[in-house]
Interface confidence: medium
């Protein structure tokens, strides 16, 4: 039967915007790396559509991966981790379209994770801690976070604090007395490695002591 | 055609600086992490420093650590290799090497034909 | 960092033998792995990579296996141009290095 029908599909399909973005994920089971890749158009139809990474692999020359509803992903402990590997959007053995990406300079850590906040009576401040994966981890050790926090009822006002360690204090006198706080941290790959802010941690909400009148202090 | 041309070498004093060059052709430089690998006389290969295509990962030998630098220059598709505080055993032939990541892991599958430094007094 | 020890260091055959030369590296590295042939006077050419994969335009006498610590160059028959000397060739992508065996010197008997 020949194959002819198709092409006429084929040729459609190229008028389509096949961009894409993705994100390496690395040690994030074990010692095993993700890559996710995704279609910036959320109305690409992406029957029959795969990806495929070839190059920067060690003992395989191509990768496929695996379709998880509108994402593309792969698992594996395959990526060597230096140089460029090309990444395309195939339909049957033919490329849409292709780009060379280091894997290392679209890394997205993992979530942190164990925010809280504890008030020191004593200092008049408060202490943040949270914890990170990466720690642990042989790669992607060095991480630059990002505590966010906010009045509660401030819905877009947020501060930003950056940090390279886990562990943030607060100055009392900073925050408004009596009030509702929600605080979230997220990290992004600094040192060697590049890429992506991770997903925010799980907020933590905190209230600040009311003013004592007496001293001009919160209690 | 893919090429690696050396130059640079030369006779210097121990203690003495020396740079020596890679010029590139006939593929695509910033794809590709790039090596110096040098072979004093007699003896075998050794593997003295890499840099990776975006020069954010480079290595050395613990034999010129402190001492040698690469470096390099993607939009004249050259690559560097500058060695300080020069001793006599750093008389070598030294390779300039691409590697080629595709086949699967590093390989170096272009070598240029080296550049020789000798450090005498 | 992996040490890789080529055994032996030289050997002498003749033209038509069947010759095999190992590495073995003191730690293990899956199958990232390749030989190289340097023959006086000239830079070193890929004949190997992945333990097992030969290179483009290499002739098929050349094989490789192995994995893990123990790897294997085979030549099944011995040509005059073959007389050279072999590098075994692992890396590590993180901190970057990349170590060379000794070499294994092959002479003609």
């Known amino acids: 039967e020949s194959g002819y029908a198709q092409n006429g599909d084929l040729e459609d399909a190229e008028l389509d915007d096949y961009s894409f973005s993705c994100y390496s994920q690395l040690e994030v089971n074990g010692s095993q790396h993700s890559l996710t890749c995704a279609f910036e158009d959320p109305d690409v139809n992406t029957t029959n559509l795969e990806f495929e990474i070839c190059g920067a692999l060690v003992e395989v020359k191509c990768l496929n991966f695996r379709k998880l509803q509108e994402i593309y992903f792969i698992e594996t402990k395959k990526f060597l981790l230096i140089g460029k590997s090309n990444i395309c959007v195939k339909v049957g053995e033919k490329s849409l379209t292709c780009k060379k990406i280091d894997l290392t300079t679209i890394v997205k850590p993992e979530a942190p994770f164990d925010l809280s906040v504890i008030y020191r009576e004593g200092a008049n401040d408060f202490v943040v801690t949270f914890n990170t994966s990466h720690l642990q981890k042989k790669y992607v050790k060095v991480l630059m976070h990002d505590v966010a926090y906010r009045q509660e009822k401030d819905e877009n006002k947020w501060t930003h604090v950056n940090l390279s360690s886990t562990k943030l204090t607060l100055l009392q006198r900073k925050l408004q007395p009596a009030a509702m706080y929600e605080i979230k941290v997220r990290s992004i790959p600094d040192h060697y490695f590049k890429g992506f802010w991770s997903e925010w941690s799980p907020s933590y909400y905190f209230r600040t002591p009311e003013i004592n009148n007496s001293s001009g202090e919160m209690d | 055609e893919v090429q690696l041309v050396e130059s640079g070498g030369g006779l210097v004093q121990p203690g003495r600086s020396l740079r020596l060059s890679c010029a590139a052709s006939?593929?695509?430089?910033?794809?590709?992490?790039m090596h110096w690998v040098r072979q004093a006389p007699g003896k075998g290969l050794e593997w003295v420093s890499g840099?990776?295509?975006?020069?954010?990962?480079?290595g050395y030998a613990d034999s010129v650590k402190g001492r040698f630098t690469i470096f390099r220059d993607n939009a004249k598709n050259s690559l560097y290799l500058q060695m300080n505080s020069l001793r006599a055993e750093d008389t070598a032939l030294y390779y300039c090497?691409?590697?080629?990541?595709?086949?699967?892991?590093?390989?170096?599958?272009?070598w240029g034909q080296g550049t020789t430094v000798t450090v005498s007094s | 960092a992996i040490q890789l020890t080529q055994s032996p260091s030289s050997l002498s055959a003749s033209v038509g033998d069947r010759v095999t030369i190992t590495c073995r590296a003191s730690?293990?590295?899956?199958?990232?792995l390749a030989w190289y042939q340097q023959k006086p006077g000239k830079a070193p050419k890929l004949l190997i990579y992945?333990?097992?994969s030969l290179e483009s335009g290499v002739p098929s006498r050349f094989s490789g296996s192995g994995s893990g610590t123990d790897f294997t160059l085979t030549i099944s028959s011995l040509q005059p141009e073959d007389f050279a000397t072999y590098y075994c060739?692992?890396?590590?992508?993180?901190?970057?290095?990349?170590?060379f065996g000794q070499g294994t010197r092959l002479e003609i008997k």
């Open positions: 090497a691409k590697d080629e990541y595709s086949r699967g892991y590093y390989v170096l599958d272009v």
């Open positions: 006939g593929f695509t430089f910033d794809d590709h992490a």
């Open positions: 840099i990776s295509w975006n020069s954010r990962g480079i």
């Open positions: 730690q293990g590295a899956s199958s990232a």
């Open positions: 992945d333990a097992s």
């Open positions: 060739q692992q890396f590590n992508s993180y901190p970057l290095w990349i170590t």
